[in-house]
Interface confidence: low
């Protein structure tokens, strides 16, 4: 058991031309988080793979408000170390993602902000409890400087953590075939206790408990030899009776996954999804808590203080699982609408519409009206992908070049006469009506109805429609 | 096809509260920002405030003291209070859609609302 | 508040033209810039967002360019209902800030 860590020293522009654009601004100030992923062995796998060496999350930096006109400068960074507890033996080979994700801090609309600005990815050899080694990563136009170790928890020691030391019994000297601890000279190394009854001769362990044979045997205590000699079945349950060389069992046979995990085959290996409290190569480490940091992917880890109590990761958009370890494909849902191009950022969704169109998910036709003027002052207004023109008072048609008869709808009622007026048209009203279309009888008494005449104006007298 | 149609009083004495409402029709309301932009008459246009979905707002502050922007989602609606006014407020004000995060972009605006504050 | 310089305050030109407006930030405001284009009587109408992002449905002949404190607006080809007066916006900061207006006229 042991401890990787990580000390990210800087994050900037790289060196050249094409500073980067400072992810925040005076308007959305944000902040720095860093995750790291670590998986063993020297293997490309996809960066949505499970952490199987673990993960750690940084606590969030400094708020940073760009300096208006100034190059993105190095941004602030949180403080301390990020550390990523590996409780089976140190690889001594290893994969590495590390992400840098920006947080805005204004007022967020449709969940938290946080986006990765950089991700950077490599694969190293690193012994146990050496010295810091240094590293350059550049992602597009920016540069993340670090540094790293893997240490050994005591009682481990060695370059993979593998070897136990004890208090020495006597000052002097280590047990029968033991030597002293280097560099703790003052303790001996322990005994590795195998599983009980594995072969002292054709099996071995790295940890307690276990029994790995040796080429050539095989068996749960390595007691059984290989043959190779022809058999019957290529998968049959003979084959660790009679010693046959056989492609042997399905990496998932037996379901080498612990607590409940699921096991499923990869062209080389084994894959365990485990159940939440549970991670590792083979769901073997428990008493997870969200200091271990087992939300991936810019998750967010709630409760678990102690390992008692559960964690829950609450994923950001576009991941799932109990560890946020599944991407979402969100796109598969075909939310961008009138052919937009669809585009999974991880933080958020986003369409890009074709032209003519806009919207968050391309909903709106703006292309009705694109290039077609209405005449005379009329407004072009669009809908079912045909444009129609609402024309000012005295034109008509199509596109508002037609100039209209007002009157021609006969708009004065009650028998009011119709006069085109240049602002429009104009109503001289039948004895007994009166308002701008006649609409309105008189009462005898000569009181109106509805509404009261404007002063000066008798009933009768031409009323103008504005 | 959004629409941004506006509405309030148009004629305001001195010290007077100015009261006007937006409605939006068509499109979503939640994921931007709307504002309030004011043009004295032969003059240039200057930004009010704005307000998102959920209340949050920002205001100009040569006008804060002064002025309230509200939200009342269950209408698509958003409004603007400006108190103690005087004739440096006569302008045609105008409410308007601001996209988040995708650079200056008020796309959609309302008609315009003159409000004229004379004794 | 960041100010907003546009110029020139007016010009005259004839249709077929290429015109170039500028406005200028008192401080480095990244891209985030639009243009607006306002007619009489009407509500302003966006152009360009980002400095350089045509807005959809606008004619290619607007053009949006420049970065951090000097931005221009061209029209490659100035048309007859191009006469209006346009107006740069920065929502780099708060306040939004509008610059002064360039009217460009018939010559």
């Known amino acids: 058991a042991g401890v990787f860590e990580l000390q990210i020293h800087s994050f900037g522009p790289g060196p050249g031309p094409g500073a980067p654009r400072s992810p925040c601004s005076a308007r959305l100030p944000c902040r720095l988080f860093f995750r790291v992923c670590l998986k063993p062995g020297l293997s490309e796998e996809a960066a949505e793979s499970p952490c199987a060496l673990g993960a750690a999350l940084s606590a969030r930096g400094p708020v940073y408000t760009e300096q208006p006109g100034a190059p993105a400068p190095d941004l602030p960074l949180p403080d301390g170390l990020l550390q990523v507890p590996f409780r089976d033996a140190w690889p001594g080979t290893f994969s590495f993602i590390i992400e840098t994700w920006r947080e805005e801090l204004g007022d967020q609309i449709g969940g938290p902000a946080w986006s990765l600005l950089a991700r950077v990815a490599g694969r190293r050899r690193l012994a146990a409890g050496g010295p810091w080694a240094r590293d350059i990563q550049r992602a597009g136009a920016w540069e993340l400087r670090f540094s790293y170790r893997a240490r050994c928890e005591p009682p481990a020691v060695g370059t993979a953590c593998t070897r136990l030391c004890r208090p020495r019994s006597a000052p002097s000297r280590c047990g029968p075939g033991l030597r002293p601890c280097a560099p703790l000279e003052d303790e001996c190394e322990a005994p590795l206790v195998c599983r009980a009854g594995c072969s002292p001769e054709h099996g071995f362990c790295e940890q307690p408990g276990e029994c790995r044979c040796l080429e050539g045997w095989t068996g749960p205590l390595c007691t059984v030899p290989v043959s190779t000699s022809s058999c019957l079945s290529p998968r049959g349950p003979s084959s660790a009776t009679t010693g046959c060389l056989v492609p042997g069992p399905g990496p998932c046979d037996g379901n080498p996954c612990a607590n409940g995990g699921s096991c499923s085959e990869t062209p080389r290996s084994f894959e365990c999804t485990c159940p939440r409290g549970f991670y590792g190569l083979r769901c073997e480490v428990s008493g997870v808590t969200c200091a271990d940091g087992p939300c991936f992917n810019g998750g967010l880890c709630v409760g678990g203080a102690d390992p008692d109590s559960a964690y829950i990761c609450h994923c950001p958009p576009g991941f799932q699982g109990s560890n946020c370890e599944k991407r979402v494909d969100r796109c598969s849902l075909q939310p961008c609408r009138n052919g937009g191009l669809c585009l999974d950022l991880g933080h958020a969704l986003r369409c890009r519409c074709r032209a003519g169109f806009a919207g968050p998910r391309c909903e709106h036709d703006l292309d009705d009206c694109a290039g077609r003027a209405c005449a005379n002052g009329g407004t072009c207004v669009e809908g079912g992908g045909a444009h129609r023109c609402s024309c000012a008072l005295g034109f008509g048609g199509r596109d508002c070049r037609e100039r209209a008869d007002p009157c021609a709808a006969r708009p004065c009622a009650h028998g009011g006469r119709c006069y085109a007026h240049f602002s429009g048209l104009v109503c001289a009203c039948a004895p007994g009506y009166m308002g701008a279309r006649c609409e309105f009888p008189v009462h005898p008494d000569g009181a109106s109805a509805l509404p009261a005449a404007p002063p000066g104006l008798r009933p009768g007298d031409p009323q103008r429609y504005l | 096809q959004v629409q941004l149609q506006q509405w309030g009083a148009g004629l305001l004495k001195p010290s007077e509260t100015l009261s006007l409402t937006c409605a939006v029709y068509g499109g979503s309301f939640s994921g931007y920002y709307w504002s309030w932009i004011r043009q004295p008459p032969g003059k240039g246009l200057e930004w009010i405030g704005e307000?998102?979905?959920?209340?949050?707002?920002n205001y100009n502050p040569s006008l804060k003291s002064r002025v309230s922007i509200s939200v009342d989602t269950s209408k698509n609606q958003f409004s603007l209070k400006l108190s103690s006014v005087t004739a440096a407020d006569t302008a045609v004000y105008y409410c308007a859609r601001g996209e988040y995060g995708s650079g200056s972009r008020f796309d959609y605006w309302g008609q315009g609302t003159l409000v004229t504050v004379s004794s | 508040a960041i100010q907003m310089t546009q110029s020139p305050s007016s010009l005259s030109a004839s249709v077929g033209d290429r015109v170039a407006l500028t406005c200028r930030a008192s401080q480095g405001i990244r891209d985030d810039l639009g243009w607006y284009q306002q007619k009489p009587g009407k509500a302003p109408k966006l152009l360009i967002y980002a400095a350089s992002s045509l807005q959809s449905g606008v004619p290619s002949r607007f053009s949006g360019s420049g970065s951090d404190t000097d931005f221009t607006l061209t029209i490659s080809s100035l048309q007859p209902e191009d006469f209006a007066t346009y107006y740069c916006?920065?929502?780099?900061?708060?306040?939004?800030?509008f610059g002064g207006g360039t009217k460009v006229e018939i010559k």
């Open positions: 916006l920065q929502d780099y900061d708060y306040p939004l800030t």
């Open positions: 307000i998102t979905h959920s209340g949050s707002t």
